[in-house]
């Protein structure tokens, strides 16, 4: 679906998948419902979607965790959707923050995040988490995508 | 507002509607501030987005509700955006859960849903909710939309 | 990035700033990881976003906020995406309701607003929040922004 | 509490088959992720392969093509089928199932590749 070849559609949708690691960077698959427009958006090293050409892009991003306030530190849950562009240092887009539940063994809750940015070629968005073993990987629960204008 | 008579714009954004039923899917109406581009994009049934167009859209949901841990079952309140392709069975896009809250008589709560998917011709969207009697219907508090990129 | 001159890409996406007023009207700046398309979307007095062409705009807003049941009202937290045309009152597109966190001395938590609406030439849209008090400000917590379709 | 056992794993030589089983007591099948982790001596874990509810799987790129997860909801238990097995896939293979955000481990059942 072409907006003509010198402005082709860009978009990605990618979802989550465990990880035995123990990195804070959540990990994704191209697998279920995915979207993968073409190559100038890729999943690089099942961490960050990467893109080939400069622009706005509204990049989102969706956790579903489930946490329970006496097992976890005091500190809140927090989902960072992080930028790395080529030759600069990593910086924080969004984040969100949920205090943990105090359901048990563990209370659900779900964050949202999504802005407009420019993007350099060859930048790379990822998604950190304060504890990634809390995050819900059943069909939909935890999401990352991004669109170009 | 077109993008040229073979690229229109598709856009809705519908609002929610309090209903008898007892379906486990949300109701919506063409009501108070809603969008719908042309007829690229229907309301079907008062449930469900329909797309004339196959592509790439961001589809969206918003949902409030209003629950308690000690009146409600013990499973979170889910919400899902689902798929029904022609001729295909309805999928999972996305889900968002949240626990229950302690408050009295019950606490508020509200997720957000949003993705970028391909959609067939006579795709439809729609949004499955645990209990639809605990969905808010006050101004804006939920709604459910998408676009065409 | 232009599409074209009669269509140029029109997005912003500015960042929460703390104030002393004591307006429900929160208030943003053009700092950090901002974006700013061109003149046809422009910040007004720090707490709205204007624009210049009819059209449709997909906008949205993300406020984290900490509160406490105890120290709070019984009235959940509530944000508001409100629209100002020119001649017209004020409406609200979306809303979204938490009820306050039990965790002291108060529970973070995230909220996520956005739609698709059909704005007028001259029309604003500003976010509205029941306790700008309780509202977090560190690095991408609460943003608000625009782009037209 | 959510238990899982393991069963099928063997010593079986280059080539052959093998098909692990995962079964679950304590947990209905509702909203899950499950998924096959293996561990070789002195290698990190890593996962080989997953299934969610809705029936979305993802494979290592070692096994891709070899390698085929599955599960029967109604038995509540998960399955591994094993092909064309190499020397290199000996390892603990451990079952994980994450219910409603909630984790179980199983104890792990060996798989021995050698002729």
């Known amino acids: 679906m072409q907006k003509g070849d010198q402005n082709p559609q860009i978009a990605a949708h990618v979802i989550s998948e465990a990880s035995s690691k123990t990195t804070s960077v959540l990990q994704w698959a191209e697998k279920g419902y995915y979207t993968m427009s073409n190559n100038l958006v890729t999943l690089e090293n099942g961490k960050q979607l990467t893109v080939k050409r400069q622009g706005l892009y509204y990049i989102y991003a969706q956790v579903t965790f489930c946490s329970n306030r006496e097992a976890s530190s005091q500190a809140p849950f927090i989902a960072s959707l992080c930028l790395k562009s080529p030759g600069r240092f990593e910086r924080i887009l969004l984040r969100a923050a949920n205090t943990h539940s105090s359901a048990k063994p563990c209370g659900q809750q779900s964050i949202h995040l999504g802005g407009v940015f420019e993007l350099q070629p060859g930048a790379s968005v990822f998604v950190n988490v304060t504890d990634p073993s809390q995050v819900s990987h059943g069909t939909g629960f935890t999401s990352f995508g991004l669109l170009k204008l | 507002m077109q993008k040229g008579d073979q690229n229109p714009q598709i856009a809705a954004h519908v609002i929610s509607e309090a209903s008898s039923k007892t379906t486990s899917v949300l109701q919506w109406a063409e009501k108070g501030y809603y969008t719908m581009s042309n007829n690229l994009v229907t309301l079907e049934n008062g449930k469900q987005l329909t797309v004339k167009r196959q592509g790439l859209y961001y589809i969206y949901a918003q949902v409030t509700f209003c629950s308690n841990r000690e009146a409600s079952s013990q499973a979170p309140f889910i919400a899902s955006l689902c798929l029904k392709s022609p001729g295909r069975f309805e999928r999972i896009l996305l889900r968002a859960a949240n626990t229950h809250s302690s408050a009295k008589p019950c606490g508020q709560q509200s997720i957000h849903l949003g993705g970028v998917f391909e959609l067939q011709p006579g795709a439809s969207v729609f949004v499955n909710v645990t209990d639809p009697s605990q969905v808010s219907h006050g101004t804006g508090f939920t709604s459910f939309g998408l676009l065409k990129l | 990035m232009q599409k074209g001159d009669q269509n140029p890409q029109i997005a912003a996406h500015v960042i929460s700033e703390a104030s002393s007023k004591t307006t429900s009207v929160l208030q943003w700046a053009e700092k950090g990881y901002y974006t700013m398309s061109n003149n046809l979307v422009t910040l007004e007095n720090g707490k709205q976003l204007t624009v210049k062409r009819q059209g449709l705009y997909y906008i949205y807003a993300q406020v984290t906020f900490c509160s406490n049941r105890e120290a709070s009202s019984q009235a959940p937290f509530i944000a508001s995406l409100c629209l100002k045309s020119p001649g017209r009152f004020e409406r609200i597109l979306l809303r979204a309701a938490n009820t306050h966190s039990s965790a002291k001395p108060c529970g973070q938590q995230s909220i996520h607003l956005g739609g698709v609406f059909e704005l007028q030439p001259g029309a604003s849209v500003f976010v509205n929040v029941t306790d700008p008090s309780q509202v977090s400000h560190g690095t991408g917590f609460t943003s608000f922004g625009l782009l037209k379709l | 509490e959510v238990q899982l056992v393991e069963s099928g794993g063997g010593l079986v030589q280059p080539g052959g088959s093998l098909r692990l089983s995962c079964a679950a007591s304590?947990?209905?099948?509702?909203?899950?992720?499950m998924g096959w982790f293996r561990q070789a001596p002195g290698k990190e874990r890593e996962l080989v392969a997953s299934?969610?509810?809705?029936?979305?799987?993802n494979y290592a790129d070692s096994v891709k093509g070899r390698f085929t997860i599955s599960a029967d909801n109604s038995k509540n238990t998960a399955y591994l089928q094993m092909n064309s097995l190499k020397p290199e896939d000996t390892a603990v293979y451990y079952c994980?199932?994450?219910?409603?955000?909630?984790?179980?481990w199983g104890q792990g059942t060996l798989v021995t590749v050698s002729s």
């Open positions: 994980a199932v994450q219910v409603n955000g909630i984790w179980a």
């Open positions: 304590g947990l209905t099948f509702s909203s899950y992720w």
């Open positions: 299934i969610t509810d809705g029936g979305s799987t």
